[in-house]
C-alpha cells in the first residue's frame, strides 16, 4: 500500500517522498499523463503500468499491505504473503531503486509541476 | 515422507477453550519458508481457513476469527498449535492442520483431521 | 475477502462421460487450486498453478480458466473420480475456499 511505498522510498533513496516526488513531473505521484518529463519520471510511469497490471489482476494496490526487509541498502521482499502482497512489493521496489539510479538527473523545477504542461502521448505500458 | 496428525479433545462445552496440536514429521518449521496452517470443516460443508504459523513465528489469522484465535509452535518438537476461546456450537468440526510452503500459494500436505463436537 | 461460487454444488456422471466442475471468483484471481476429498478423508492436493496436475493424478484430468472464471474438468468420468472437489485461491489475504462439488458415479 501507500504507506509500504512512502517507506521504502526513503530508505532507499534518503528523500521524503512527501516533499520530494508526490508529486514531481507528470507521472509521480497520484494519476499521471503526457510524456514523462525525465528518467525520475519516466520510474513512475513505469511504477503506474505496474500497478495497472495489478489491478487487472484483482489486488488491492493502495491496501494491500506487505512486509518487507531494508538491509545493508537492500530490499527483499517477503514470500510469506499471498501473491497480491508479493507482486506489489516487487513494484514498488523496482520504482524505489529506479528512482535512487536517477537522482543524479532529479531536478527541482519538476517538484510541483503544473500538470496541464503535462503534454504529449501518453506512454503505454 | 511428509505427514502431519491432529489431536484434541473431541468434546467441549460452550464458552470453553479449544486446545488443538498439529504433530507432524518430514519436514522442519526450522527451514526458511516452511509454515503450516490450521484449517477446518464443519460437518458435510466447505474448508475454512483459520491461521498460519511461519518458520521464523510470523503468524496469519482469518480476519473474522482473529480475536478468538492464537496459534503456536514448538520447533523441536515439530508441532504446531491452535487455541481456540469461547467456543460455540457453530465451531464444531473437523480441524486439519497443513503445510503450506511460502513460494507455493496452496497447501500441499493435509492431517488426517481431528473432529470437534460442541455441545451446549 | 475474495468469495468462490462452485456449480454445480452436486452433480452425477456416467462413466466415461465428460465432467466440467466451474469455481467464479467475486474478483479476479492469478491462479486457482483444486482439491480432491473422499469421505472420512482429508483434502488431497489435486491440480495447482490453475492447470498443473499434482503428482499421481491421473491424465485425464485438466484445470483451466484465468481471471474470475476456473474450471476442473476430467475428460473420461471414472468410478475413482467420484468425490467431492474445492477449488482455493490465495491471490489476496485471506486464502479462501469453495464451497465443494460433489461429484457423484451413476
Known amino acids: 500500500g501507500i504507506l509500504n511505498l512512502n517507506k521504502m522510498v526513503k530508505q532507499v533513496t534518503g528523500k521524503m517522498p512527501i516533499l520530494s516526488y508526490w508529486p514531481y513531473g507528470c507521472h509521480c505521484g497520484l494519476g499521471g499523463r503526457g510524456q514523462p518529463k525525465d528518467a525520475t519520471d519516466w520510474c513512475c510511469q513505469t511504477h503506474d503500468c505496474c500497478y495497472d497490471h495489478l489491478k487487472t489482476q484483482g489486488c488491492s494496490i493502495y491496501k494491500d499491505y506487505y512486509r518487507y526487509n531494508f538491509s545493508q541498502g537492500n530490499i527483499h521482499c517477503s514470500d510469506k504473503g499471498s501473491w497480491c502482497e508479493q507482486q506489489l512489493c516487487a513494484c514498488d521496489k523496482e520504482v524505489a531503486f529506479c528512482l535512487k539510479r536517477n537522482l543524479d538527473t532529479y531536478q527541482k523545477r519538476l517538484r510541483f509541476y503544473w500538470r496541464p504542461h503535462c503534454r504529449g502521448q501518453t506512454p503505454g505500458c | 515422507q511428509v505427514t502431519l496428525k491432529e489431536s484434541g479433545p473431541g468434546i467441549l462445552q460452550s464458552s470453553q477453550t479449544l486446545s488443538l496440536t498439529c504433530s507432524f514429521s518430514?519436514?522442519?518449521?526450522?527451514?526458511?519458508?516452511?509454515?503450516v496452517s490450521w484449517i477446518r470443516q464443519p460437518s458435510g460443508k466447505g474448508l475454512e481457513w483459520l491461521a498460519h504459523i511461519y518458520w521464523d513465528d510470523d503468524k496469519r489469522y482469518n480476519p473474522s476469527l482473529k480475536s478468538r484465535l492464537t496459534i503456536s509452535k514448538d520447533t523441536s518438537r515439530n508441532q504446531v498449535f491452535l487455541k481456540i476461546t469461547s467456543v460455540d456450537t457453530a465451531d464444531s468440526a473437523t480441524y486439519y492442520c497443513?503445510?503450506?510452503?511460502?513460494?507455493?500459494?496452496?497447501?500441499?500436505?493435509w492431517g488426517q483431521g481431528t473432529t470437534l463436537t460442541v455441545s451446549s | 475477502q475474495i468469495v468462490l461460487t462452485q456449480s454445480p454444488a452436486i452433480m452425477s456422471a456416467s462413466p466415461g462421460e465428460k465432467v466440467t466442475i466451474s469455481c467464479s471468483a467475486s474478483?479476479?484471481?492469478?491462479?486457482m487450486y483444486w482439491y480432491q476429498q473422499k469421505p472420512g478423508s482429508s483434502p488431497k492436493r489435486w491440480i495447482y498453478?490453475?492447470?498443473k496436475l499434482a503428482s499421481g493424478v491421473p491424465a485425464r484430468f485438466s484445470g483451466s480458466g484465468s481471471g474470475t472464471s476456473y474450471s476442473l474438468t476430467i475428460s473420461s468420468m471414472e468410478a475413482e473420480d467420484a468425490a467431492t472437489y474445492y477449488c482455493?485461491?490465495?491471490?489476496?489475504?485471506?486464502?479462501?475456499f469453495g464451497s465443494g462439488t460433489k461429484l457423484e458415479i451413476k
Open positions: 482455493q485461491q490465495y491471490h489476496s489475504y485471506p486464502p479462501t
Open positions: 474478483s479476479s484471481v492469478s491462479y
Open positions: 497443513a503445510r503450506r510452503e511460502s513460494k507455493y500459494f496452496y497447501f500441499d500436505y
Open positions: 498453478d490453475t492447470s
Open positions: 518430514g519436514f522442519s518449521l526450522s527451514t526458511s519458508g516452511m509454515g
